[in-house]
């Protein structure tokens, strides 16, 4: 069986301030078991945007229903975009671990650019 890939098909997305951004991400396999997380930026200072396993993120909704056992679409929508949301967003697959899940594979990233509202 081929190893899971995390696919972010959009290199960049341009969204007007105040609108909703859709960041697309799919996995090619259900294996290994473990959650998806979305981050803005890379490295130790990256910002958690969405965590499938824990918490509620009021501005973030998933495009598909992640409670479905066979779901492999981890795309998200971020509402009410502001210029502060600009950056590169990474969809990251984690492998279930004990006590902590282990980062397994990251998508290539999607750069979100924000167009100012015309005044």
């Amino acid at each position: 069986e081929e190893e899971l890939q995390v696919i972010q098909p959009d290199k960049s997305v341009l969204v007007a301030a105040g609108e909703t951004a859709t960041l697309r991400c799919t996995a090619t396999s259900l294996i290994p078991v473990g959650p998806i997380q979305w981050f803005r930026g890379a490295g130790p200072g990256r910002e958690l945007i969405y965590n499938q396993k824990e918490g509620h993120f009021p501005r973030v909704t998933t495009v598909s229903d992640l409670t479905k056992r066979n779901n492999m679409d981890f795309s998200i929508r971020i509402s009410n975009i502001t210029p502060a949301d600009a950056g590169t967003y990474y969809c990251v697959k984690f492998r279930k671990g004990s006590p902590d899940d282990v980062e397994f594979k990251s998508g290539a990233g999607t750069e979100l650019s924000v167009r100012a509202k015309p005044s």
Partner: antibody
């Protein structure tokens, strides 16, 4: 076999405290968010509090906020509910339940409940 | 908080009958609506998750549908063991909320 066993219920006077426990077995406790739900006699279900698998995210119903504290010890496979400043309206059967992964998931296993009676 | 309103509050039906219970949400919960069955003195049991998915081990006579604000639980042919109270519950956003329950009684 998945098992959730609540304990710690009883009769307590208004204003006093009580700590409920929920012992989990038959599954990897640290993978699951956990919930407390209560049911007053003859009434419906009311969500009380929830805690994520690593305790990073905790939420409370407005009716218990500031009085109840949910916590967990993953090394002991145990969930807790510390209840302070108890009121007559807290009288209920308290259930613990588990929730797989994120916030949107349902409560797929429940304990049998422990009765808390607040009365002078 | 999102309010859930179940209808009817109680229902008398006969074995073999088809029964429908509805749950309305005060705002959209997308598909994050779940249904539970509770018998007297027992803990609730998950029947349907995320609007239409049958939980493992639950008989196929139970089905769910809906999205947004309107949801339905259907029992295609009532069996004696189905007489119980049914609750809907949303998990779209905190706080989690339950409907007030629908008590299904034998006619």
């Amino acid at each position: 076999e998945v098992q959730l066993v609540e304990s710690g219920g009883g009769v307590v006077q208004p204003g006093r405290s009580l700590r409920l426990s929920c012992a989990a077995s038959g599954f990897t406790f640290s993978d699951y968010g956990m919930i407390w739900v209560r049911q007053a006699p003859g009434k419906g279900l009311e969500w009380v509090a929830s805690i994520s698998s690593s305790s990073s995210y905790i939420y409370y119903a407005d009716s218990v906020k500031g009085r109840f504290t949910i916590s967990r010890d993953n090394s002991k496979n145990t969930l807790y509910l510390q209840m302070n400043s108890l009121r007559a309206e807290d009288t209920a059967v308290y259930y613990c339940a588990r929730r797989y992964y994120g916030f949107n998931y349902p409560f797929d296993y429940w304990g049998q409940g422990t009765m808390v009676t607040v009365s002078s | 908080a999102i309010q859930l309103t179940q209808s009817p509050s109680s229902l008398s039906a006969s074995v073999g009958q088809r029964v429908t219970i509805t749950c309305g949400a005060s705002k959209s919960v997308r598909t994050y609506m779940h249904w539970y069955q509770q018998k007297p003195g027992k803990a609730p049991k998950l029947l349907i998750y995320s609007a239409s998915n049958l939980e493992a081990g639950v008989p196929s006579r139970f089905s769910g549908s809906g999205s947004g604000t309107d949801f339905t639980l259907t029992i295609s042919s009532l069996q004696p063991e189905d007489f119980a109270t049914y609750y809907c519950q949303q998990s779209n956003e905190p706080p989690y909320t339950f409907g007030q329950g629908t008590k299904l009684e034998i006619k």
